[in-house]
């Protein structure tokens, strides 16, 4: 008789999940020689241990602590770039501006980027059919808890001027329910972080509005100011030109507004 299996509302575990995590770990250590001490088999074992045989709606940050310990990494605390709803441009930026880091430029972020995973209570199986959706099923699912844990730690590590890239094309440029709005903003340490500088990325070619005056940006400024952190905001009117100027800052066209 086939065993009853819980049907969740979200997509199932990404195919080749164990192989992908292990391969990404080895690739990361190949790309980052300073992380060559990491034992990727142990990393996978710790990752697996966080969610295998556990109810996928009952995952805690504690479950991920062994993985967090193995993935401990020092990034320059004053070179952190946070982002919300504009991941691709943030990653393009750190690819060019090599001394700055998004969460996905760290080992743990790189391992899990764009992947989905979950297990089942009391079996060692990975569920490739479906996984809990944050809204429709439960928030304490393996993926959401992972990103909450690593995002909190990443924000806590930040110092001096922290940058955040925000998507100016969205109705809520700053969204309190995003990982940035619900986790990272609240875990920046006022005794270490002097300023949060928001870069609002414009989508439209002819969009010359000052999106730093958007009500949601004002809301972000208010939250940050109440936490005794200074706030500043810049419009990035031409993201393509912005990236080009990061690549070639001496270009004559890069002195004007971007």
């Amino acid at each position: 008789v086939p065993r009853w299996r819980q049907q969740w509302s979200g997509p199932g575990t990404t195919k080749r999940f164990p192989e992908t995590v292990l391969a990404r770990c080895v690739k990361y250590t190949e790309i980052h020689p300073e992380m060559r001490h990491v034992d990727c088999q142990s990393v996978w074992d710790a990752f697996k241990g966080a969610f295998i045989s556990k109810h996928p709606c009952n995952i805690t940050e504690e479950d991920y602590q062994p993985l967090m310990k193995l993935g401990t990494q020092t990034v320059p605390c004053n070179k952190i770039l946070l982002w919300s709803r504009i991941k691709d441009l943030a990653h393009q930026f750190t690819q060019v501006q090599r001394d700055m880091f998004t969460l996905e430029d760290t080992l743990l972020g790189y391992l899990a980027d764009d992947l989905t995973w979950c297990g089942e209570f009391n079996t060692s199986k990975i569920n490739y059919q479906s996984c809990p959706d944050w809204r429709k099923d439960c928030s304490n699912n393996p993926v959401s808890v992972f990103w909450k844990t690593v995002s909190r730690r990443f924000a806590e590590a930040a110092c001096d001027v922290v940058h955040v890239m925000l998507n100016g094309s969205r109705s809520k440029i700053f969204d309190k329910n995003s990982t940035f709005g619900s986790v990272e903003v609240h875990n920046l340490q006022p005794e270490k972080v002097q300023t949060l500088e928001a870069w609002v990325i414009h989508g439209g070619r002819e969009d010359s509005r000052d999106l730093c005056q958007d009500p949601t940006i004002k809301e972000l400024e208010s939250i940050i100011s109440k936490r005794n952190i200074q706030f500043s905001c810049k419009n990035i009117y031409r993201p393509d030109k912005f990236l080009q100027c990061v690549k070639n800052p001496e270009d004559s066209s890069c002195t004007s507004e971007i």
Epitope: R16, E19, T20, A23, R24, V26, K27, E30, I31, P33, R36, H91, Q95
Partner: antibody, heavy 120, light 107 residues
């Protein structure tokens, strides 16, 4: 088995560009970093850079920065290396290479090489 | 960049000889070193990785030793197929760098 098959020999004029391809088979293309190495006639080996096929991230040797671009097409499991503003000292055999994950980070697999001749 | 210096640049030997090639790194590279064999018109072939581990399919007459800055490749009893050029390579740090090569020729 793992195979890296490169495109054929090229003859280019100084100032031109060349694009060498490297088609991978026998493994999951996105699971491994691809490196490029070149060897001028009668000379030693020179590492040029790497690309992560999964994300398109790259890192290039300082001396080639601005002239080299490495790309991949994951749908065909092919890596490309483009070199621009060619000079006579770019005449070399160009190799793609990858590690085996079980052999440290030495290059266990190599393409057969592509001879690029730069001559006016 | 880390400089890799190989010696000798040419080595004449006979079948059955024991030969040693040395590679020196300009800074500590721990055991992050590979040795390759290359024959004319062919791609290099990995012989040794992590300074002393034998790659798959490589005859046991090849061995590597050393760590830090001094490394050696030893062929215990030369075979006719072993006459080729040998390169060391460090993969401790980017940019990866190779030694200038040692050409092993028949005496």
């Amino acid at each position: 088995q793992v195979q890296l098959v490169q495109s054929g020999a090229e003859v280019k004029k100084p100032g031109a560009s060349v694009k060498v391809s490297c088609k991978a088979s026998g493994y999951t293309f996105t699971d491994y970093i691809m490196h490029w190495v070149r060897q001028a006639p009668g000379q030693g080996l020179e590492w040029m850079g790497w690309i992560d096929p999964e994300y398109g991230r790259t890192d290039y040797a300082q001396k080639l920065q601005g002239r080299v671009t490495m790309t991949t097409d994951t749908s065909t499991s092919t890596a490309y290396m483009e070199l621009r503003s060619l000079r006579s000292d770019d005449t070399a055999v160009y190799y793609c290479a990858r590690s085996a994950h079980t052999t440290g980070f030495g290059f266990a697999y190599w393409g057969q090489g592509t001879l690029v001749t730069v001559s006016s | 960049d880390i400089q890799m210096t190989q010696s000798p640049s040419t080595l004449s030997a006979s079948v059955g000889d024991r030969v040693t090639i040395t590679c020196r790194a300009s800074e500590d590279i721990y055991s992050n070193l590979a040795w390759y064999q290359q024959k004319p018109g062919k791609a290099p072939k990995l012989l040794i990785y992590d300074a002393n581990s034998l790659a798959d399919g490589v005859p046991s007459r090849f061995s590597g030793s050393g760590s830090g800055t001094e490394f050696t490749l030893t062929i215990s009893s030369l075979q006719p197929d072993d006459f080729a050029t040998y390169y060391c390579q460090q993969y401790n740090n980017y940019p990866y760098t190779f030694g200038q090569g040692t050409k092993l020729e028949i005496k």
